[in-house]
C-alpha cells in the first residue's frame, strides 16, 4: 500500500481467482483513543472499533472510503483504491491502446517546436467518475523540472456504438534551450482513477522525436503572366522555432487532380515557393518537416486551383 | 587544450554541402546498423545516450545562433561563445567566435573519426563479419574536415592489445552512431545558419 495523495491510498493486488489479497491496517487520524468506530462509504454498518482497523483487501468491494467516527462526528477518511496486477502485468483498462506508432501506446505526445513545450493526449471510452493527474520530468535518476497543467477533456467522438473521449495536457520544460542536444529523455507519468480503480501510464521520449510542425501558413497562388502556371508560395508556421536559418524546414508540395483516383504529383523542396500548372478543380497542398531530423510531417495546408 | 588555428582559403567555404552529405551518410549508416544488429539493443529507446565530446568540445554553445543568446537556458552550461557575424565564407574577416565554432566542429569530427576507425579495426576481426563502417561515411567526415581547413595535431588511432568483445563493440557502435547523428544535425543547422548569415 502507498499514498497517492493525502488520505488516498493505493493497494496493489495480484488479481487471480481466490487470491489472498492484501492485509491493510488503517489508522484514524485523531488524538482520541476510545469510542472510535469505522464505516465504509455511505453504509452505516460498523466494520470495527478502535483507533486502527485491519482489513483484508481482495476485491473492489473492499475498496472505497473508510471513515472513522466518534459520537456521530467524522474524525478522518482514508480512500482505498485498487491497482490490479494480472499475470505480472499492471492493468490498463481505463485508457485505450492507440496502437500508433506501436502496440501498447496509451499516451501520445507532440511538440510544435524545440521550445520544450509539448502536448500529450490519451483516449478512453469512460465518461464519468474519472480523474487524471500528470507529472513529468527530464530524466528519472536526477530529474529536471517539467511543469504540466491539468488534464482536460479535449474532444469527443463517436466510434461505432461507442463514444470515445480524448483528454490532453500541456507541459513545459522549465529551462529548455531549443538548440540543446538531448541526452536524457522526457518522462511523462499519468495517474488515472476510475471509481475505485487506479492505473498508471508512462511515456518516455526526446522532444526531437515528437516534433510535428504546424502546417505552412499563408499558402497563396499568384498567376504568372501569359501562362497556365501559378507561383505557389507559403511561409514557415508562426509556432516554429527561430531563427529559421538554423531550425530549417523542408516541404512536400503536392498537386491533386479533382478525382482522388488520379495520381498525385509531388516533390520535396527546401524553398518556400514553386511553380505549378494549376488545372481546374485541382488542389495544391504543402506540408512541412524538420529539414535535418526526420520526425513527423505537419498536416497539409491546401488551396484550390480555381 | 590548444584550439586549432584557422587557415582560411579564399572563396566559398563548401561546408554546407559537406555537412549535408555527412548527415545523410551517418543516417544511412545508423539505419544499416539498426537493421543488421536487429537482435542487439540498437534503437534510440534501448541505448544509453553518451556524448564522447562532452567536456572536450562545446559545439552547441560555441555555435549558438545570435538569436538564442538571449535565452538563459542556452547559456547556463558553460562559458559560452556565440556566432556573432560572418557566413560560411572562409574570408580573412572570419570572426573569432565563428573560428571557435568551426574549430569545435573540427574537433568533434576528429574525435569521432578516431573512434570509428578504432572500432572498424575491431569489427574487421569479427569472425561473423556482421557489420563494418561505411567507407563513404568515413570519407565524408574526412572531406568536411578538409573543407573546414584547420591545422591540428593528428590524434593517433587507439590500439588495444586485448581480445575485442564483439558484442560490446557493436553496442558501442550503435551508441556512437546515435550520438554522431545528433551532432551531425547540429552541424548541419550551424552550416545552414552560417550560409544564410
Amino acid at each position: 500500500i502507498w499514498e497517492l495523495k493525502k488520505d488516498v491510498y493505493v493497494v496493489e493486488l495480484d488479481w487471480y481467482p481466490d487470491a489472498p489479497g492484501e492485509m491493510v491496517v488503517l489508522t484514524c487520524d485523531t488524538p482520541e483513543e476510545d469510542g472510535i468506530t469505522w464505516t465504509l462509504d455511505q453504509s452505516s454498518e460498523v466494520l470495527g472499533s478502535g483507533k486502527t482497523l485491519t482489513i483484508q483487501v481482495k476485491e473492489f468491494g473492499d475498496a472505497g472510503q473508510y471513515t472513522c467516527h466518534k459520537g456521530g462526528e467524522v474524525l478522518s477518511h482514508s480512500l482505498l483504491l485498487l491497482h490490479k496486477k494480472e499475470d505480472g502485468i499492471w492493468s490498463t483498462d481505463i485508457l485505450k491502446d492507440q496502437k500508433e506508432p506501436k502496440n501498447k501506446t496509451f499516451l501520445r505526445c507532440e511538440a510544435k517546436n524545440y521550445s520544450g513545450r509539448f502536448t500529450c493526449w490519451w483516449l478512453t471510452t469512460i465518461s464519468t467518475d474519472l480523474t487524471f493527474s500528470v507529472k513529468s520530468s527530464r530524466g528519472s535518476s536526477d530529474p529536471q523540472g517539467v511543469t504540466c497543467g491539468a488534464a482536460t477533456l479535449s474532444a469527443e467522438r463517436v466510434r461505432g456504438d461507442n463514444k470515445e473521449y480524448e483528454y490532453s495536457v500541456e507541459c513545459q520544460e522549465d529551462s529548455a534551450c531549443p538548440a540543446a542536444e538531448e541526452s536524457l529523455p522526457i518522462e511523462v507519468m499519468v495517474d488515472a482513477v476510475h471509481k475505485l480503480k487506479y492505473e498508471n501510464y508512462t511515456s518516455s521520449f526526446f522532444i526531437r522525436d515528437i516534433i510535428k510542425p504546424d502546417p505552412p501558413k499563408n499558402l497563396q497562388l499568384k498567376p504568372l503572366k501569359n501562362s497556365r502556371q501559378v507561383e505557389v508560395s507559403w511561409e514557415y508556421p508562426d509556432t516554429w522555432s527561430t531563427p529559421h536559418s538554423y531550425f530549417s524546414l523542408t516541404f512536400c508540395v503536392q498537386v491533386q487532380g479533382k478525382s482522388k483516383r488520379e495520381k498525385k504529383d509531388r516533390v520535396f523542396t527546401d524553398k518556400t515557393s514553386a511553380t505549378v500548372i494549376c488545372r481546374k478543380n485541382a488542389s495544391i497542398s504543402v506540408r512541412a518537416q524538420d529539414r535535418y531530423y526526420s520526425s513527423s510531417w505537419s498536416e497539409w495546408a491546401s488551396v484550390p486551383c480555381s | 587544450r590548444n584550439l586549432p588555428v584557422a587557415t582560411p582559403d579564399p572563396g566559398m567555404f563548401p561546408c554546407l554541402h559537406h555537412s549535408q552529405n555527412l548527415l545523410r551518410a551517418v543516417s544511412n549508416m545508423l539505419q544499416k546498423a539498426r537493421q543488421t544488429l536487429e537482435f542487439y539493443p540498437c534503437t534510440s529507446e534501448e541505448i544509453d545516450h553518451e556524448d564522447i565530446t562532452k567536456d572536450k568540445t562545446s559545439t552547441v554553445e560555441a555555435c549558438l545562433p545570435l538569436e538564442l543568446t538571449k535565452n538563459e537556458s542556452c547559456l547556463n552550461s558553460r562559458e559560452t561563445s556565440f556566432i556573432t557575424n560572418g557566413s560560411c565564407l572562409a574570408s580573412r574577416k572570419t570572426s573569432f567566435m565563428m573560428a571557435l565554432c568551426l574549430s569545435s566542429i573540427y574537433e568533434d569530427l576528429k574525435m569521432y573519426q578516431v573512434e570509428f576507425k578504432t572500432m572498424n579495426a575491431k569489427l574487421l576481426m569479427d569472425p561473423k563479419r556482421q557489420i563494418f563502417l561505411d567507407q563513404n561515411m568515413l570519407a565524408v567526415i574526412d572531406e568536411l574536415m578538409q573543407a573546414l581547413n584547420f591545422n591540428s595535431e593528428t590524434v593517433p588511432q587507439k590500439s588495444s592489445l586485448e581480445e575485442p568483445d564483439f558484442y560490446k563493440t557493436k553496442i558501442k557502435l550503435c551508441i556512437l552512431l546515435h550520438a554522431f547523428r545528433i551532432r551531425a544535425v547540429t552541424i548541419d543547422r550551424v552550416m545552414s545558419y552560417l550560409n544564410a548569415s
Partner: nanobody, 125 residues
C-alpha cells in the same frame, strides 16, 4: 538503369535563345523528378531548374526565373529547357538528371541518381 542524353546546346549571341532536350531510355521516367544543372569552367555544378514526375510542379534558380522554362513530355520520355534572353553568365555545360521523387529536395544535386554527359552552351557578346 536509366540513360540520359542531352542535345540542343551551341553558341549564341547575348539575348538569343536555345532549347535543350534530354531524352531518357531504359525506364519510363514519369515517376522521376528531372532537373537541369550546369557547370561553368572552374566552378561548382549548380542547380538551374527542376520538374516533377507529371510535370505539374517546377522550380528555378533565381537568376534564370522568367527567362528559362522547364517542361517535359512523358510520352516521349523527354525533358526540355527553353532558354530565352541568354546572358554570358549562362555559359556552361548543361547536364540533365533524373531521380526518384522521394530521394530529397528536387533542387538539390544529391537527390538525383542518373546523369547525362552534358551539352555545351556558350553565350558570347
Amino acid at each position: 538503369q536509366v540513360q540520359l542524353v542531352e542535345s540542343g546546346g551551341g553558341s549564341v549571341q547575348v539575348g538569343g535563345s536555345l532549347r535543350l532536350s534530354c531524352v531518357g531510355s531504359g525506364r519510363t521516367l514519369n515517376m522521376y523528378n528531372m532537373g537541369w544543372f550546369r557547370q561553368a569552367p572552374g566552378k561548382e555544378r549548380e542547380f538551374v531548374a527542376a520538374i516533377s514526375g507529371k510535370g505539374l510542379i517546377s522550380d528555378y534558380r533565381d537568376s534564370v526565373k522568367g527567362r528559362f522554362t522547364i517542361s517535359r513530355d512523358n510520352a516521349r520520355n523527354t525533358m526540355y529547357l527553353q532558354m530565352n534572353s541568354l546572358k554570358p553568365e549562362d555559359t556552361a555545360v548543361y547536364h540533365c538528371a533524373a531521380g526518384q521523387w522521394s530521394a530529397g529536395p528536387f533542387t538539390r544535386e544529391r537527390s538525383y541518381e542518373y546523369w547525362g554527359q552534358g551539352t555545351q552552351v556558350t553565350v558570347s557578346s
